[in-house]
Interface confidence: medium
């Protein structure tokens, strides 16, 4: 766990992520990292005649030399980066104060990093971090050069064979947005058939025309025979 | 904590290499972010360079940005600050220090752990 402390004193603002550093999570998944703290002095007041501070949360993610705060809460609201929006969230606060918590969804390879828990309350801040390591890596698999040639079933076994498993759509999706192309149409763990375009071309629109992003034949009958994609956790 | 052992600091010419070492021992060395900091005489002790735990997250100060790679081997508890294209600015006392915590602009405060530091001088 990683816990760091402003000052020597028992009654300082402290804050900590009771996790072991790095984090080793799976792509397409999502994240809790749990943060807390403790404030022994709340609360913290400017002057009689004002209400208390409230304490102040921030998260940050500090990768490739770039700091990037995700969001801030205070007082009950959470404002979140926008580029974030739909991506990162606090499930505990503010129904539990002390709780900052960060939920990440649907992780990316560039979502690695180092994540910040920053609580500020007056003049006093804290903060803990915790090293995330995206794994897994999506790739397209074809039997020997021949398309689609693979049912639903031989279409597993043909990941287990490459020492990986079948892709979820959440993986696919991952990958895509890490910047996957393939104009392939492969099987995926819940029986969909999709493939992930960037620059949509003839032969490659689905059911998405000129638009980017990951093509669905939806659920398809097992014996349908089409490509693969698998999942690994390591390439060697 | 951890004990931090540095060397492989000398004498080298502007242009040229060396490669610091910095030897942990004690528990759980890959828990550590690690850093390279460095004094001139008369000046601050100023942030070289931070990895994080796996290593895989690195940051730099500008001025050794592109010239100086850090790295580390936890099987071998230790971590490495490669230094090429010297300039006789980079005259100092390099110490190597151990903290749980990890920015984009680290300061001393964020390390619990120091080694005695090791002498890099460059000439003209």
């Known amino acids: 766990a990683v816990t760091v402390e402003t000052s020597d004193h028992d009654n300082s603002l402290s804050v900590s992520i009771p996790q072991p550093s790095p984090l080793r999570v799976l792509l397409g998944t999502s994240l809790t990292i749990p943060c807390y703290f403790i404030d022994p002095m709340h609360p913290v007041t400017t002057a009689p005649s004002t209400a208390p501070l409230a304490p102040r949360i921030k998260w940050s993610r500090v990768s490739k030399e770039k700091e990037v705060v995700l969001l801030v809460a205070t007082e009950g609201r959470v404002r979140v980066n926008s580029a974030y929006q739909d991506k990162v969230s606090l499930p505990n606060y503010p129904a539990i104060p002390s709780d900052a918590t960060l939920e990440v969804q649907s992780l990316r390879s560039n979502d690695s990093g180092v994540y910040r828990c920053e609580v500020m309350h007056g003049i006093e801040d804290s903060e803990a971090t915790l090293e995330v390591v995206v794994k897994g890596i999506v790739f397209h698999y074809r039997a020997i050069s021949t398309r689609y040639t693979l049912d639903f079933d031989r279409a597993q076994r043909a990941c287990l064979q490459n020492s990986a498993i079948i892709a979820t759509p959440e993986q696919l999706q991952a990958a895509y947005e890490d910047g996957f192309h393939q104009c392939d149409a492969g099987w995926l763990a819940d029986q969909t058939v999709r493939y992930p375009i960037h620059t949509p071309r003839e032969g490659c629109y689905g059911d998405k025309d000129e638009f980017p992003g990951v093509r669905t034949y939806g659920i398809r009958d097992t014996n349908e025979t089409y490509d693969v994609y698998c999942f690994a956790e390591e390439m060697e | 904590e951890v004990q931090l052992v540095e060397s492989g600091g000398g004498l080298v010419q502007a242009g040229g290499s060396l490669r610091l070492s910095c030897a942990a021992s004690?528990?759980?060395?890959?828990?550590?972010?690690m850093g390279w900091f460095r004094q001139a005489p008369g000046k601050e002790r100023e942030f070289v360079s931070i990895?994080?735990?796996?290593?895989?997250?690195?940051v730099y100060a500008d001025s050794v940005k592109g010239r100086f790679t850090i790295s580390r081997d936890n099987a071998k508890n230790t971590v490495y600050l490669q230094m090429n294209s010297l300039k006789p600015e980079d005259t100092a006392i390099y110490y190597c220090?151990?903290?749980?915590?990890?920015?984009?602009?680290?300061?001393?405060?964020?390390?619990?752990?120091w080694g005695q530091g090791t002498q890099v001088t460059v000439s003209s």
């Open positions: 990895i994080s735990w796996s290593g895989g997250s690195t």
């Open positions: 220090a151990a903290g749980r915590l990890y920015r984009a602009t680290p300061r001393p405060a964020d390390f619990g752990s």
């Open positions: 004690g528990r759980s060395f890959s828990s550590y972010a």
